[in-house]
């Protein structure tokens, strides 16, 4: 059986100031068992953007419904878009552990631009 | 507004233990990692531990085997602590939250921790 | 570990001059370099990160450059609310995160 592999098929996205920006990700299997985390950044200091287990993320929505059953989208689209938000975005599956989840891979990242709006 | 408070500091004898803690508030806490930054009085500033969003923990050379750095979540508030306190562990103890540059963009004011005997 | 050497360790200046003091690297750190200001008493504030972008808030006439191991910081004219301590910080992906001695800008 191959090894889940993480594919965020585009390198960079530009998105206009105040549109939303799709981000995409998908994995090539449903194991191993784990949620995915959406982040900014790769370092010890990255930002977390989504997490599919828990928390609050007011602008953010999944292009898919990830608890249907066999989902292996894991897209995600960002209102409201500043320039603040420009960076790269890396998608990560994480393996399901105790106590905690384990990362297990990361997608290659898409660098998120942001043009002015347009007048 | 974003906002850090450390609490916990105090006078404490080489080799006994102190806490610190850091109330956040201002910002998602729980999507950011945050770090511990020290100054011993009239010198510079030293890095001393972060803690990521996932729960990572990394420490200074200085401190490794010595010191924990820990977070709840529900309450915003990251912790370190200190056991077996050395005299060259005397600063002021900042805490400060990372953005995902891992650049420390907001800082408390900052604990003193005296260690002598 | 990196080690940051600033100089020079204290620069006296007159209100309205320019400031320009460097931070350089004991191996590369690309862009990845960070300044902060500390006036006594207060906590540090982020000024520039990646070497030359300015923090929110942060005036135009601070600004930074360089690459690898050498990197300057320059006020264009001092404002006497300028007159601290400034530190660099290297911000590569991983700790240990590692900060230079510092240059304090006096008055003259």
């Known amino acids: 059986e191959d090894e889940l592999q993480v594919i965020q098929p585009e390198k960079s996205v530009s998105v206009a100031a105040g549109e939303s920006a799709t981000l995409r990700c998908a994995m090539t299997s449903l194991i191993p068992v784990g949620p995915i985390m959406w982040f900014r950044g790769a370092g010890a200091g990255r930002e977390l953007i989504y997490n599919q287990k828990e928390g609050h993320f007011p602008r953010v929505t999944t292009v898919s419904e990830l608890t249907k059953r066999n989902n292996l989208d894991f897209s995600i689209s960002i209102s409201n878009i500043t320039p603040a938000d420009a960076g790269t975005y890396y998608c990560v599956k994480f393996r399901k552990g105790s106590p905690d989840d384990v990362e297990f891979k990361s997608g290659a990242g898409t660098e998120l631009s942001v043009r002015a709006k347009p007048s | 507004d974003v906002q850090l408070v450390e609490s916990g500091g105090g006078l404490v004898r080489p080799g006994e233990s102190l806490r610190l803690s850091c109330a956040a508030s201002g910002f998602t806490f729980t999507n950011y990692a945050v770090t511990w930054v020290r100054q011993a009085p009239g010198e510079g500033l030293e890095w001393v531990s972060l803690i990521s969003v996932t729960g990572t923990t990394y420490y200074a050379d200085s401190v490794k085997g010595r010191f924990t750095i820990s977070r709840d979540n529900s309450k915003s508030t990251l912790y370190l602590q200190m056991n077996g306190l050395r005299a060259e562990d005397t600063a002021v103890y900042y805490c400060a939250k990372v953005t995902w540059k891992n650049v420390f963009d907001y800082w408390g004011l900052g604990t003193l921790v005296t260690v002598s005997s | 570990e990196i080690v940051l050497t600033q100089s020079p360790g204290t620069l006296s200046v007159s209100p309205g001059e320019r400031a320009t003091f460097s931070c350089r690297a004991s191996q590369t750190v690309g862009s990845k370099l960070a300044w902060y200001q500390q006036k006594p008493g207060q906590a540090p504030r982020l000024l520039i990160y990646?070497?030359?972008t300015r923090a929110t808030g942060i005036p135009a006439r601070f600004s930074g450059s360089g690459s690898g191991t050498e990197f300057t910081l320059t006020i264009s004219s001092l404002q006497s609310e300028d007159f601290a301590v400034y530190y660099c910080?290297?911000?590569?992906?991983?700790?240990?995160?590692?900060f230079g001695g510092g240059t304090k800008v006096e008055i003259k």
């Open positions: 990646d070497a030359n």
């Open positions: 910080q290297q911000h590569t992906d991983w700790p240990p995160y590692t």
